[in-house]
């Protein structure tokens, strides 16, 4: 079996994860994908997922999540915005691709929000702080339910410094509550 | 082999702004992360900002917000920053420096691997 | 905002010694650190990414290690070359930030 690796971040409540998921254009572009949380021992659970067919550079916010497809640079972009301490825990991008299994983007992510506002967010208020206050229109999402039983994850060995998934429920909005955010100037 | 060319040397005067250019050759400019890191004569290196250009949006050090502005022209691969309200203190040379895009998360994994030439610009009455 | 601690903030040393130079973050940055050498009048130059990494074209007697908070930059054979000034970086939330540099100096 493939080893799946992981890269950690550490970072303080009221931060901002920002990461970036890449994927062979050829075969993904227009593919609908997805930011999922792995729990040890359970499925992963979809948090949010772009439109299908994933529209390029078109941001879909669930809560406190934001992603971005960028089409012509096999880029799928992740935020977090206002990071708390629950939000601790292993995540990954996916890509839809029925009747197949979601196809996993390579690395996956173990997040550890400690306590302390460090003072700035992760982006700055000046840059796309801003943008999370505008009035949202929602719609419904399309995030397909199914997951397949080969996803089931048998969670990697932790290190002493990790952090585990909490029990709690990340704190979002309901899922099916998409919101469109405008294209940053 | 990528190449990142800065614009030449400015003198400006207090109070003034000054836009320094960085032209990125041989490579991926749009995905990459590009920051502006400044030294001032004697002292250690400070990070001013950066910014992904197909993202569009800049981050910014504290100390430089409202003051620094950031953009990045994809059609030329050109990056720029522009400081403004300029002080003695602000004299310093100027660097731009890229991260290229990794197949990591993490915008920044490799570092900041390509650096700019430098800027000088000093700040005088 | 991290802050990034350099120790010593000089040395000296003799060709062929072996040079140990290190760096705290005030905060874990899991690896998200890099490693920058500076000569006088010239651009800094990436040694190591992703705290143990080495930068292609870098010569093999540099090396990092640690993660968390505590890093480590080691020249195993000081080199002419290598009189220089070294700089830290972490890279695992904006801002980014840098250590306040450590002149190596010949003896």
């Known amino acids: 079996a493939t080893k799946l690796t992981e890269e950690k971040y550490e970072l303080k409540e009221g931060q901002t994860l920002d990461v970036k998921c890449d994927y062979t254009l050829e075969k993904f572009a227009s593919s609908q994908k997805a930011w999922q949380i792995i729990r040890d021992g359970e499925m992963p659970k979809t948090l949010a997922c772009t439109e299908r067919p994933s529209k390029n550079s078109h941001p879909v916010q669930v809560g406190r999540i934001i992603l971005e497809d960028y089409h012509d640079h096999g880029l799928l972009r992740v935020r977090m915005v206002n990071l708390q301490v629950e939000d601790s825990g292993l995540y990954q991008c996916v890509i839809y691709q029925p009747p197949k299994e979601p196809h996993m983007l390579f690395d996956r992510i173990r997040l550890v929000v400690t306590k302390g506002f460090s003072g700035t967010p992760g982006s700055n208020e000046n840059s796309t702080q801003n943008v999370y206050k505008i009035p949202p229109t929602t719609t419904k999402a399309l995030c397909p339910l199914y997951t397949s039983p080969r996803t089931v994850t048998q969670a990697p060995p932790k290190s002493t410094a990790d952090v585990s998934t909490p029990d709690s429920e990340i704190n979002l909005t309901n899922v099916t509550d998409i919101i469109r955010v405008p294209v940053f100037n | 082999q990528v190449q990142l060319v800065q614009s030449g040397a400015e003198v400006k005067k207090p109070g003034s702004s000054v836009k320094v250019s960085c032209k990125a050759s041989?490579?991926?400019?749009?995905?990459?992360?590009i920051s502006w890191v400044r030294q001032a004569p004697g002292q250690g290196l400070e990070w001013m900002g950066g910014?992904?250009?197909?993202?569009?949006?800049?981050n910014y050090a504290q100390k430089f917000q409202g003051r620094v502005t950031i953009t990045a022209d994809e059609s030329t691969s050109t990056a720029y920053m522009e400081l403004s309200s300029l002080r003695s203190e602000d004299t310093a040379v100027y660097y731009c420096?890229?991260?290229?895009?990794?197949?990591?998360?993490?915008?920044?994994?490799?570092?900041?691997?390509?650096w700019g030439q430098g800027t000088t610009v000093t700040v005088s009455s | 905002d991290i802050q990034m601690t350099q120790s010593p903030t000089s040395l000296s040393a003799s060709v062929g010694d072996r040079v140990t130079i290190t760096c705290r973050a005030s905060?874990?940055?899991?690896?998200?650190l890099a490693w920058y050498q500076q000569k006088p009048e010239k651009a800094p130059k990436s040694l190591i990414y992703?705290?143990?990494s080495l930068q292609s074209g870098v010569p093999s007697r540099f090396s990092g290690s640690g993660s968390g908070t505590d890093f480590t930059l080691t020249i195993s054979s000081l080199q002419p070359e290598d009189f220089a000034t070294y700089y830290c970086q972490q890279y695992n939330s904006y801002p980014l930030t840098f250590g306040g540099g450590t002149k190596v100096e010949i003896k």
């Open positions: 420096a890229r991260a290229s895009q990794s197949r990591s998360s993490n915008y920044y994994y490799y570092g900041l691997d390509v």
């Open positions: 041989g490579g991926t400019f749009s995905s990459s992360a």
């Open positions: 905060q874990g940055i899991s690896s998200w």
């Open positions: 992703a705290a143990s």
């Open positions: 910014i992904i250009p197909i993202f569009g949006t800049a």
